[in-house]
């Protein structure tokens, strides 16, 4: 046990204010009452408190609140906010956006990219789902949070919303959020036209299966590269090269400069050389010809 | 189950000691504050003292403060009071009291021990 | 200190009847820390109320708590019984916590 500490009665805090940026550490342990604390916690983020004393009110506040803090408190955390862990906020229950706001507010410039992701979560559960309202949120104070979510918690997220996403909200997402995301934004602009359709979904096919990628060469989109590379490999894979041409059209020349990047690289591995030669852009690695392609997959599939 | 059960109550003169023990068992103690609450014969219930699990921070009504000392040992599940300069207007029944934080209040009490102050 | 005043001190009814009890507070409390107990004779208190307004775990929903800044309010929509007892509310912040003096709620 911490040696116990008893307050000077001169020291004795009744309510929190600058005077306590004079308390020595063992004084704020000692005279600050956690709940006292607790309740003007919308007073500690106007006091300029030293790091070291953040500290002390972090640790008043875990001792009284050893589940995690209730809402009220962490809706006013303010610079205490840069404090906690991810283990802290993971103990959480927040469902206001007032509260996800303040934070994400408060994380601006500062390394806190586990925190936020941690805090981000805890509103969708807090919330029961990742409504409009907390994408809004999120588009508006922190441009690509929406990535930081796992995919079991962008199953969540309602089709309908999909269209307020903006495709930098997207940049870092990784294949198995975009594999969450790509059906629902299918959904979601399913009754648009073929520009506007490949407009909208183009920032979310990373998620995309072969079958639309081959739907998609029919319709004429011209696809960038920088959209192509981030494609699925196991999408990319089993187009043709007819196919791949089709998808990007005049952008197929770009093909030669990411020949040695994946999903090109691979792509080409896959091909027949003669027809690559085809695309007249000197791409070399395909299957040169006269080779029989086996796909022993597919054999032991049968087996 | 909370269960709290108050010790150390009886018979002492004015002037004397005493040491009042909580045992208590069915939650994590080590997280807990606990406070004491005192009722005298047929009055209201007092506030006495009060301690931080952890760091054993602790607050005192005025009335007892400098004769009366809370503590804990978190490894026993145990809260006392140590009862000094003791006066005929200490006479109560002394409760144990577990405050719950996220309700902030008392909310499992122990069924009190018997504190008479008399010569 | 905050000082709580509870009234009436005794409040004299028939079961099946409506209780209020007001407790005020001699300066603003705020209500997440204002509970309501009960307490019959020869037992410890029991937590009714906390935050004003929750009941704690167990309690019927005939007991009910409101009010904020310096004035809260006990209701007890209808008398049972095993309602006659002695209410007492509390502040918990900041220290020292106190106790309104008890309202008795007596069988007319």
């Known amino acids: 046990d911490v040696e116990r500490t008893t307050c000077p009665p001169e020291k004795e805090v009744h309510e929190i204010d600058e005077s306590l940026i004079f308390y020595k550490k063992r004084e704020l342990e000692a005279c600050v009452d956690a709940a006292l604390l607790a309740a003007q916690m919308d007073r500690v983020d106007a006091i300029p408190f030293t790091y070291e004393q953040l500290d002390v009110l972090k640790h008043k506040l875990d001792e009284l609140y050893p589940q995690g803090y209730p809402e009220s408190v962490i809706r006013h955390l303010g610079h205490l906010f840069l404090k906690m862990s991810p283990e802290d906020i993971r103990k959480w229950n927040v469902t206001s956006l007032e509260t996800l706001k303040a934070l994400l507010k408060v994380s601006k410039g500062h390394e806190m990219s586990a925190q936020v992701a941690t805090l981000i979560d805890r509103v969708v559960v807090g919330r029961g789902q990742l409504d409009k309202d907390t994408a809004d949120t999120l588009t508006a104070f922190c441009p690509g949070c929406l990535c930081s979510l796992s995919p079991e918690r962008l199953s969540s997220v309602p089709p309908s919303i999909i269209g307020a996403v903006r495709p930098q909200d997207l940049d870092t997402c990784g294949p198995r959020q975009l594999d969450v995301l790509y059906p629902k934004a299918r959904l979601a602009f399913q009754n648009m036209s073929g520009s506007e359709y490949f407009v909208k979904i183009r920032p979310f096919l990373g998620g995309a299966p072969t079958e639309d990628l081959k739907a998609l060469s029919q319709q004429n989109v011209s696809m960038d590269l920088a959209t192509f590379m981030k494609l699925r490999r196991e999408a990319v894979l089993p187009l043709s090269v007819a196919e791949v041409q089709k998808l990007l059209g005049p952008h197929v020349e770009g093909l030669k400069v990411e020949e040695q990047h994946s999903p090109v690289r691979d792509w080409i591995l896959k091909q027949r050389q003669d027809d690559l030669d085809t695309l007249g852009l000197g791409l070399q690695g395909g299957i040169p010809n006269g080779y029989l392609i086996l796909d022993l997959s597919v054999r032991e599939a049968l087996s | 189950e909370v269960q709290l059960l108050e010790s150390g109550g009886g018979l002492v003169q004015p002037g004397g000691s005493l040491r009042l023990s909580c045992a208590a068992s069915?939650?994590?103690?080590?997280?807990?504050?606990m406070s004491w609450v005192r009722q005298a014969p047929g009055k209201g219930l007092e506030w006495v003292s009060a301690i931080s699990p952890t760091y054993s921070t602790t607050n005192y009504a005025d009335s007892v403060k400098g004769r009366f000392t809370i503590s804990r040992d978190n490894n026993k599940n145990t809260l006392y009071l140590q009862m000094n300069s003791l006066r005929a207007e200490d006479t109560a029944v002394y409760y144990c009291a577990r405050y719950n934080a996220y309700h902030a209040a008392l909310d499992y009490w122990g069924q009190g021990t018997l504190v008479t102050v008399s010569s | 200190e905050i000082v709580l005043t509870q009234s009436p001190g005794t409040l004299s009814l028939s079961p099946g009847e409506r209780a209020t009890l007001s407790c005020r507070a001699s300066q603003s409390v705020s209500s997440s820390y204002l509970a309501w107990y009960q307490q019959k004779p020869g037992q410890a208190p029991r937590l009714l109320i906390y935050?004003?307004?929750s009941r704690a775990t167990g309690i019927p929903d005939r007991f009910s708590g409101s009010g904020s800044g310096t004035d809260f309010t006990l209701t007890i929509s209808r008398l049972e019984p095993e309602d006659f007892a002695v209410y007492y509310c509390q502040q918990t912040v900041p220290y020292p916590y106190t106790f309104g003096q008890g309202t008795k709620v007596e069988i007319k």
């Open positions: 069915g939650f994590t103690f080590t997280h807990t504050y």
């Open positions: 935050g004003a307004s």
